[in-house]
Amino acid sequence: VPLSRTVRCTCISISNQPVNPRSLEKLEIIPASQFCPRVEIIATMKKKGEKRCLNPESKAIKNLLKAVSKERSKRSP
């Protein structure tokens, strides 16, 4: 990790932009911990493998999380 810092958070900026679940490669939810005192959500996009930090408080991102978990529950037996 390139940034030298005492707190080991990942996100420098956060995005409120809606993300199409179909364009997602991966969605990581990192819970708050002793290393970083806030929840961080990192979306890896299919296009060029771009990683984007999402705002956990954003309505659009909350809807995305719901959509993704719904999709996962459909897939699991």
């Epitope: 390139p2 810092r5 900026s13 970083c36 984007r52």
Partner: antibody, heavy 124, light 109 residues
Amino acid sequence: QVQLVESGGGVVQPGRSLRLSCTASGFTFSDYGMHWVRQAPGKGLEWVAVIGYGGLIKGYADSVKGRFTISRDNSKNTLYLQMNSLRAEDTAVYYCAREGAGSSVYYYYGMDVWGQGTTVTVSS
Amino acid sequence: EIVLTQSPGTLSLSPGERATLSCRASQSVSSSYLAWYQQKPGQAPRLLIYGASSRATGIPDRFSGSGSGTDFTLTISRLEPEDFAVYYCQQYGSSPIFTFGPGTKVDIK
């Protein structure tokens, strides 16, 4: 519209202190990392410092480490640069710049909005 | 510490010509961390390219970025009068954390 306005520059003697401010408008300041970048007269760009959207991540160029402190007040939409022990080589135009939305330690979206700069002259 | 070198220092071209600007890193840089900026005299820099090849919002498609590892390129397919400026590459990921190259000046022949 999206705007960054720097202030606080001026002429200061070597060894003295100065605090620069950058006031943001037209966007949700608390969602964005912010930078200070400087440019000495007739020279190229030099990155100075970064602060994450919530103030938890901070980083400094070696040339200012221990002398400059970056901070922010999200309630006032304002970014600061406290500059102590100033030297002649700190003379430059100081720009504040916004880190692109969604940037992380894994992917860099660049500095997508810049102020017009404030001039700092360190001279006896 | 990664050092960026840009070449040529100055590029003299005519409007309508193709400009190819080079940025070389002293060590391998992830393309996720490479950006290009344009700066005109008396103005603040403007972001052109991030992630080595993605155009920033509002940037015309005559600007394109490419490259990986230690060699990156900014290409302006057909120079417009407003493109004559200084261009900087920038990398994120070493100490100092964000490093700019020395710049390439594109001026009118």
